[in-house]
Interface confidence: low
């Protein structure tokens, strides 16, 4: 069997949801000594980065300027050490946002409910779309989908205090082209026992864990600080 290196990890810096015309940054974390990293888009070669010095860098950043719907889709990366190529990374879905209209998000029976109550979010968007997405801030990978023409429902069922937090919705023109985000709606769920004066902590939106964490070898120790490698060809 043909020998391959372990697959790299591909991540989006800051977020995989990139406003149109803004720059997207994807990180490919491979291995020290990798001489070349390739970014693939929808199965085809999209960009190449060659770190210098390769033995002291375990990944690269790919900057994708002027985000638009043609650049939104599925990305993956591979790397090479000598003549040996790695397996392909997992796929990363890069989404362009701020396309066309802005939806309106509402919640019923209201933003303040008691644990156990049934709650439904409604996302309304004027522009033609068939899919709507509801995201809880800080959990942007946990996307709920619903279908409708101008408005979609997101029944949450009986809620618990775990549902507390801020929500936004998007209309999706295709899997990778989303509308502007709605204004956030904060859901407050009061419990029977716990201290309800403690407001839930809302992680910043988008997720903090989407950050690229590339490491640089400095002798025996690795510098775990964020490090922006601008590749030179």
């Amino acid at each position: 069997p043909k020998q391959t290196l372990p697959k790299p990890i591909i991540r989006a810096e800051s977020t995989y949801m990139v406003p149109k015309e803004k720059q997207a940054t994807l990180c490919c974390q491979g291995s020290y000594g990798a001489v070349e990293y390739q970014l693939h888009f929808e199965g085809s070669l999209f960009a190449v980065e060659r770190p210098k010095p390769p033995e002291r860098i375990n990944g690269v950043k790919f900057h994708i300027p002027d985000m638009n719907s043609r650049k939104a889709g599925r990305y993956s990366c591979i790397y090479r050490v000598g003549e040996l190529w790695s397996e392909r990374s997992d796929l990363l879905d890069l989404v362009v946002t701020e396309m066309y209209d802005t939806p309106t998000l509402s919640v019923h029976p209201g933003p303040e409910v008691t644990s156990g109550e049934k709650v439904t979010f409604y996302c309304r968007l004027d522009t033609a779309t068939s899919m709507f997405l509801l995201l809880k801030e800080g959990r942007s990978r946990d996307v709920q989908r619903s279908y409708g023409k101008v408005q979609a429902e997101f029944p949450m069922g009986p809620v618990t205090t775990a549902h507390r937090g801020s929500y936004r919705c998007f209309g999706s023109y295709n899997n990778y082209a989303w509308s502007f985000p709605s204004e956030p709606v904060k859901l407050l769920v009061t419990g029977d026992i716990e201290n309800t004066s403690l407001a839930p902590t809302d992680p910043t939106f988008p997720d903090s864990w989407d950050t690229c964490l590339l490491t640089r070898e400095t002798g025996l120790q690795k510098d775990l600080a964020l490090w922006d490698h601008t590749a030179q060809n």
């Epitope: 701020e98 066309y100 209209d101 802005t102 309106t104 309304r124 004027d126 522009t127 033609a128 023409k149 101008v150 023109y173 502007f180 985000p181 709605s182 204004e183």
Partner: antibody, heavy 116, light 107 residues
């Protein structure tokens, strides 16, 4: 009831700018996008662009991009359309229209005449 | 952009008769097609949304049909106040586009 009331007729010189207002009432202004459609004398309807008052997101017809600016003031429920570098062919009736999927409510129209 | 083509440009029909107006999109717009009526000196008025959905306050004699690229507005029995210009509109994708209009005149 929903009402869109536009500012009055304007006469402008070529090369100048015009700003037309559209005051909305009878509904929650931020819940619908507001668009501008124009109609030259004896001609059909032409979409210029729209705005989401929610956060100011805009979409423009490329034909007008760079010349048209659409804004909205949530505090007064008023949308504005400014068209710059006016030329004689911009002589038209300009309508604001609320969009709820379709253009379900329209302003009465503002006549803009461009003449030297 | 999606080009909307209406036919005929002018339609002459007698009051009490049936009028059929056509609209064709240059590519499929599903049922995201809206119809408007405009009388001289007035703003357009929404008649039908999403190809066939009726609008509150619009007489039942106005109906719409079609999906994809071909659409029809039917006025079952023309009243004198129905003589006007009718426009179809692509509501599917930006830029939003209108047909050039069909003028419905008294025969």
């Amino acid at each position: 009831q929903v009402q869109l009331v536009q500012s009055g007729a304007e006469v402008k010189k070529p090369g100048s700018s015009v700003k037309v207002s559209c005051k909305a009432s009878g509904y929650t202004f931020s819940e619908y996008t507001m668009h501008w459609v124009r109609q030259a004398p004896g001609q059909g309807l032409e979409w210029m662009g729209g705005i989401s008052p929610n956060i100011g997101g805009t979409s423009y017809n490329q034909k007008f991009k760079g010349r048209v600016t659409i804004t909205a003031d949530k505090s007064t429920s008023t949308a504005y359309m400014e068209l710059s570098s006016l030329r004689s062919e911009d002589t038209a009736v300009y309508y604001c229209a609320r969009r709820g999927g379709s253009f379900d409510y329209w302003g009465q129209g503002t006549t803009v005449t461009v003449s030297s | 952009e999606i080009v909307m083509t209406q036919s005929p440009a002018t339609l002459s029909v007698s009051p009490g008769e049936r009028a059929t107006l056509s609209c064709r999109a240059s590519q499929s717009i599903s049922d995201y097609l809206h119809w408007y009526q405009q009388k001289p000196g007035q703003a357009p008025r929404l008649l039908i949304k999403y190809a066939s959905q009726s609008i509150s306050g619009i007489p039942a004699r106005f109906s719409g049909s079609g999906s994809g690229t071909d659409f029809t507005l039917t006025i079952s029995s023309l009243e004198p106040e129905d003589f006007a210009v009718y426009y179809c509109q692509n509501g599917h994708s930006f830029p939003l586009t209108f047909g050039q209009g069909t003028k419905l005149e008294i025969k």
